[in-house]
Interface confidence: low
């Protein structure tokens, strides 16, 4: 339905508070280096303009598209060329090329200082002094560091952030109340950002069809009682929502997400029996709850899949009539029967089925040709099952930190050209799959583990894309979205890699390591481990373990010493010499 003024339409639909928050998120995700005050000024100008359009939709410029209005506003930033370099060239383009240009300059790893959490009393004072500015600053800081964060979900996080401060700043022990809540929001926020980044990568790198296939599989697992046509409608609407958010159209995205939540709740009876509680919540909580809702129970009387998709003599005719709909039905029917499979596995099965039909429907005897197609699924199913079994056993044996170290060594040997910070970040996250998924029963392990690994490997892919250094990473990241994990799993030690020159500075540590948190200390040690492997890629597990044990003992000893700095200098030299000898450096 066409509106005379798009900006007035969205302002009225979303309300002033959400409108301002979403425009701030959009601007911060585009211009990630701009100071907070500059963004607030731009947002206020856009908001005042929107109000004039609400009052009179025929007023000057009110008929312009949101991209035109927002792009024009961003291009008024005086320091655009100094701060952003070639991004300023976007402003010479016309829409829609200008918006595409801004999107291409989004930086997944912006050069921004780490967010340091102030003292609780300082935060509470700031919160009480100016709640609105405090919350806006939260949106700004998250959005600029996570340029693909799902904007309507960030509003939900901000609501929880506000609730935490409202409750805890008047508690007897503010810190005990607030810090666990902030830790939880930080961890959930990072996970949410990474999940959304995969959705955007799926749409932008592999296209709408790939995203829709993912959505059919996931929604069919979640809503196995819903008809195929119902699932298809939800997939179409969900694809629109995520296409908009990934494209920077945050107002439309938030508006359409609210409409989708409304539709789902109005049609619960034909979708899922698990939605009742979600649908009683306010909008932001409702949308979040629906996105996380548990799988409904499978209908009891589902017939065998083989009848429609293998035994039927009409398979090729049905496939030819409407290929994507027929494959969509196959994926829907398979996924609703298999909540125990990962989405990526289901997509691999559907791809195998499609490839078989393409080949067999052109054969002399199609039915004879595709009769055994389900047998081809067996190895595809067993591969992730075995991998998860082995890795969960290793995790249970080692614990999270040492399991991460095993993965650090494994991945550094596979792709040693990748930067050390990226290898540490990605391997630490890969290692978290253990505590996240291995506790689950068999039936829930694979969807938990493999779909989580898809999210983490996508982080590697987007970080690597910014500065490509490894053909192997590029190959695994670009060839097939659903085969990324098997592709990385199959990589062996890179025999072409020339070991890094030894640099003593890399292994020089100072007393500041003693004041770090346990997590930061682990990262320091893991950084050293990656560097060791880059110097000596053929080092055995035993050699590396011996050096790491010595390193841990060295840090512990020097942190207990009276003159810590001297200890680090002297003992450090000994450790480096001993390590070189142990590894033959």
């Amino acid at each position: 339905d066409a509106h005379k003024s798009e900006v007035a339409h969205r302002f009225k639909d979303l309300g002033e508070e959400n409108f301002k928050a979403l425009v701030l998120i959009a601007f911060a995700q585009y211009l990630q280096q701009c100071p907070f005050e500059d963004h607030v000024k731009l947002v206020n100008e856009v908001t005042e303009f929107a109000k004039t359009c609400v009052a009179d939709e025929s007023a000057e410029n009110c008929d312009k598209s949101l991209h035109t209005l927002f792009g024009d506003k961003l291009c008024t930033v005086a320091t655009l060329r100094e701060t952003y370099g070639e991004m300023a060239d976007c402003c010479a383009k016309q829409e829609p090329e200008r918006n595409e240009c801004f999107l291409q300059h989004k930086d997944d790893n912006p050069n921004l200082p780490r967010l340091v959490r102030p003292e609780v009393d300082v935060m509470c004072t700031a919160f009480h002094d100016n709640e609105e500015t405090f919350l806006k600053k939260y949106l700004y800081e998250i959005a600029r560091r996570h340029p693909y964060f799902y904007a309507p979900e960030l509003l939900f996080f901000a609501k929880r952030y506000k609730a935490a401060f409202t409750e805890c700043c008047q508690a007897a022990d503010k810190a005990a109340c607030l810090l666990p809540k902030l830790d939880e929001l930080r961890d959930e926020g990072k996970a949410s950002s990474a999940k959304q980044r995969l959705k955007c990568a799926s749409l932008q790198k592999f296209g709408e069809r790939a995203f829709k296939a993912w959505a059919v599989a996931r929604l069919s697992q979640r809503f196995p009682k819903a008809e195929f046509a119902e699932v298809s409608k939800l997939v179409t609407d969900l694809t629109k929502v995520h296409t908009e958010c990934c494209h920077g159209d945050l107002l439309e995205c938030a508006d359409d997400r609210a409409d989708l939540a409304k539709y789902i709740c109005e049609n619960q009876d034909s979708i899922s029996s698990k939605l009742k509680e979600c649908c009683e919540k306010p909008l932001l909580e409702k949308s979040h709850c629906i996105a996380e809702v548990e799988n409904d129970e499978m209908p009891a009387d589902l017939p065998s899949l083989a009848a429609d998709f293998v035994e039927s003599k009409d398979v090729c005719k049905n496939y030819a009539e409407a290929k994507d709909v027929f494959l969509g039905m196959f994926l829907y029917e398979y996924a609703r029967r298999h909540p125990d499979y990962s989405v990526v596995l289901l997509l691999r099965l559907a791809k195998t089925y499609e490839t078989t039909l393409e080949k067999c429907c052109a054969a002399a005897d199609p039915h004879e040709c595709y009769a055994k197609v389900f047998d081809e699924f067996k190895p595809l199913v067993e591969e992730p099952q075995n991998l998860i079994k082995q890795n969960c056993e290793l995790f249970e044996q080692l614990g999270e930190y040492k399991f991460q170290n095993a993965l650090l060594v494994r991945y550094t040997k596979k792709v040693p050209q990748v930067s050390t910070p990226t290898l540490v970040e990605v391997s630490r996250n890969l290692g978290k799959v253990g505590s996240k998924c291995c506790k689950h029963p068999e039936a829930k392990r694979m969807p938990c583990a493999e779909d989580y690994l898809s999210v983490v490997l996508n982080q590697l892919c987007v970080l690597h894309e910014k500065t490509p250094v490894s053909d192997r990473v590029t190959k695994c990241c670009t060839e097939s979205l659903v085969n990324r994990r098997p592709c990385f799993s199959a990589l062996e030690v890179d025999e072409t890699y020339v070991p890094k020159e030894f640099n003593a500075e890399t292994f020089t540590f100072h007393a500041d390591i003693c004041t770090l948190s346990e997590k930061e200390r682990q990262i320091k040690k893991q950084t050293a481990l990656v560097e060791l492997v880059k110097h000596k890629p053929k080092a055995t597990k035993e050699q590396l373990k011996a050096v790491m044990d010595d390193f841990a003992a060295f840090v512990e000893k020097c942190c207990k010493a009276d003159d810590k700095e001297t200890c680090f200098a002297e003992e450090g030299k000994k450790l480096v010499a001993a390590s070189q000898a142990a590894l033959g450096l």
């Epitope: 008809e227 195929f228 046509a229 119902e230 179409t236 429609d308 009539e321 409407a322 709909v325």
Partner: nanobody, 115 residues
């Protein structure tokens, strides 16, 4: 909620014509291929005809080729089946479906060809 409502059926003499309609709602009609299937008394479902999402590509079962024409109007979210030269063996309940699906929606519309 997804709804497909068939209409236009009735009693017609052999050689006569009917035009069936299927009004669709609750999903993005223009994004999907659609089909007509039918079920004769005491028989299983039989696929009749299919059309792609844009209306350019149409398919027919051998038994109706040259007599039936499938079409669609995406602006009205409606699927049609023009049936000419009707025969007694065309007597059935006709259903429209999304894609070519074993599931069916709506009540169907009954076509009886008899003198």
């Amino acid at each position: 909620e997804v709804q497909l409502v068939e209409s236009g059926g009735g009693l017609v003499q052999p050689g006569g014509s009917l035009r069936l309609s299927c009004a669709a709602s609750g999903f993005t009609f223009g994004s999907f291929g659609m089909s007509w299937v039918r079920q004769a008394p005491g028989k299983g479902l039989e696929w009749v005809s299919a059309i792609d999402s844009g209306g350019a590509d149409t398919r027919y079962a051998e038994s109706v080729k040259g007599r039936f024409t499938i079409s669609r109007d995406n602006s009205k979210n409606t699927l049609y089946l023009q049936m000419n030269s009707l025969r007694a063996e065309d007597t059935a309940v006709y259903y429209c479906t999304i894609g070519r699906s074993a599931s069916r929606w709506g009540q169907g519309t009954t076509v009886t060809v008899s003198s």
